[in-house]
Interface confidence: medium
């Protein structure tokens, strides 16, 4: 059994957490798929209504703590976070974990957690980011293919299919050229525009109260832009926005390109069709 002091301390902490929490952690992306040897960037947006003096942050992978530094005076107490992990803080609200180079064992479920330690204890946790790492080494597949007894037949099959594809392609291209000449419409590189590029480093009416009597640079499917900071949307502006939260609007700050985390819903918007978010402290 713990000492009375410990028990009292715990009760004080529990009481403090029952106070209104204004700390929010939004993490992204939900899913990140990268090639081995490339770079993965995970972003955690930490917002609080009022100022804070000291913020404890934590990144975990599959439940294990990677790092647990704090931020004070605008600086991180630690710059590294797990193997090949680099941590950075960009005011006012972005904590970034960059894995470079990514290895196969970086695959896993990452969670960002934050706690304001000063002035008052408040904590919040992000959602999981699932990181999948694709092997990029052709030798990983070589042994498996070479050991296959019918390897020669596979090669022959692939070869003949390749020839057939070339012949078909030439015929198709000829027809396509004729059609384009007839119609005058050129789709240009329509086919190539759908090829995904995987970058190594993915560069986001009020009433009376008289007193007398709150850019999207799409790099690839792996990273989109993170508006910085998340815009505060006034309640009163009418915004036809399909998302359950208001459309981003320009706000001062420097963009950190990562994952888009849209701001909160504006009361002018229609409530979610399936009800409001779960009630409770974050």
């Amino acid at each position: 059994m713990g000492s009375p002091g410990m028990v009292l301390g715990l009760l004080v902490q529990i009481w403090a957490l029952q106070e209104a929490s204004s700390l929010s952690v939004q993490q992204g992306p939900n899913l990140l798929q990268v090639r081995q040897g490339s770079q993965a960037t995970l972003v955690c947006q930490v917002d609080q209504a009022t100022a804070w003096e000291r913020l404890r942050v934590k990144w975990t992978k599959d439940g294990a703590i990677l790092c647990q530094p704090y931020i004070t005076n605008g600086s991180l107490s630690l710059g590294v976070c797990g193997p090949q992990g680099r941590l950075s803080w960009q005011a006012p609200s972005h904590l970034t974990l960059q894995l470079d180079p990514v290895s196969l064992n970086h695959s896993g479920a990452y969670v960002c957690w934050a706690a304001v330690e000063i002035p008052e204890l408040e904590e919040a946790e992000g959602n999981i980011t699932r990181l999948f790492v694709d092997p990029d080494d052709p030798t990983q597949n070589r042994n498996r293919i070479a050991s296959f007894p019918g390897f020669l037949f596979v090669l022959l099959g692939v070869g003949s299919m390749g020839v057939a594809a070339i012949v078909w392609g030439a015929w198709f291209w000829g027809r396509r050229s004729c059609q384009q000449r007839d119609s005058g419409n050129s789709p240009g590189n329509a086919f190539y525009s759908n090829v995904l590029y995987r970058p190594r480093g993915a560069p986001k009416k009020s009433e009376d109260c008289s007193g007398e009597g709150k850019d999207q640079r799409g790099q690839s499917i792996y990273s989109t832009s993170f508006p910085q900071p998340a815009p505060r949307q006034p309640h009163l502006a009418s915004r036809p926005c399909p998302s359950p939260r208001p459309c981003p609007s320009p706000r001062p700050g420097h963009p950190v390109s990562m994952v888009r985390v849209s701001p909160r819903p504006s009361p002018t918007q229609q409530p979610r069709p399936k009800g409001f978010p779960k009630v409770g402290e974050e």
Epitope: T50, A51, W52, P92, C209, Q233, R264, S266, P267, P277
Partner: antibody
Framework: QVQLQESGPGLVKPAQTLSLTCTVS??????????WSWIRQFPGKRLEWMGY???????SYNPSLKSRVTISRDTSKNQFSLKLTSVTAADTATYCC????????????WGQGTMVTVSS | DIVMTQSPDSLAVSLGERATINCKSS????????????LAWYQQKPGQPPKLLIY???TRESGVPDRFSGSGSGTDFTLTISSLQAEDVAVYYC?????????FGQGTKLEIK
């Protein structure tokens, strides 16, 4: 659009409890990220923040009033309420409900306000 | 608690002229962690609730005319109306949003000279 409407007695006797309700329309008070405040404006125009309740039911109060003030909510009616005990003439003011959103501690939607006089 | 003091208490300015209202806080409202100053400005016209004009000391609220601007850092802040219009007659308040309790200045009454 969101609208806030205060209701309650306009006259309260000294030492009694002042009770006011703010009815919110056009928006759910349980929506994540929203904070529902009470602010009063004295006859001399001075503004005082009294406290707020958040979407999860957590509260924060002005320490100058903490022993006397309670803010609660009724999500089924989409209302939040103010209780101020042991009132004196100094509590005579226009009481307004307001909201702050998106984790920024300032107020962009206000109710019409209701004048409360403390007098025997 | 952070004490907010506005000056002057009242101000008379000619139409088209510049109006300047000052606000001083008893402690710094700047956070080096977020590079933000936690100060807001409101306008309250007779018979209306306060209306948010500026937050984070210098960010203009959506729909607020650009003749309104906020400046300052730390403990000293200014609200400037570059060219006074008749509809700007009101009481102006500053409010810090650095920590709880949130507190307001006593207000500055702006009139036309």
């Amino acid at each position: 659009q969101v609208q806030l409407q205060e209701s309650g007695p306009g006259l309260v006797k000294p030492a009694q409890t002042l009770s006011l309700t703010c009815t919110v329309s056009g928006f759910s008070i349980s929506t994540s990220g929203y904070y529902w405040s009470w602010i009063r404006q004295f006859p001399g125009k001075r503004l005082e923040w009294m406290g707020y309740i958040n979407y999860g039911g957590g509260t924060s109060y002005n320490p100058s009033l903490k022993s006397r003030v309670t803010i609660s909510r009724d999500t089924s009616k989409n209302q939040f309420s103010l209780k101020l005990t042991s009132v004196t003439a100094a509590d005579t003011a226009t009481y307004c409900c307001a909201t702050m959103a998106d984790r920024f501690a300032f107020f962009d939607v206000w109710g019409q306000g209701t004048m409360v006089t403390v007098s025997s | 608690d952070i004490v907010m003091t506005q000056s002057p208490d009242s101000l008379a300015v000619s139409l088209g002229e510049r109006a300047t209202i000052n606000c001083k806080s008893s402690q710094s409202l700047f956070s080096s962690n977020t590079n933000r100053n936690y100060l807001a400005w409101y306008q309250q016209k007779p018979g209306q609730p306060p209306k948010l004009l500026i937050y984070h000391a210098s960010t203009r609220e959506s729909g607020v005319p650009d003749r309104f601007s906020g400046s300052g850092s730390g403990t000293d802040f200014t609200l400037t109306i570059s060219s006074l219009q008749a509809e700007d007659v009101a009481v102006y308040y500053c409010q810090h949003h650095y920590e709880t309790p949130l507190t307001f200045g006593q207000g500055t009454k702006l009139e036309i000279k």
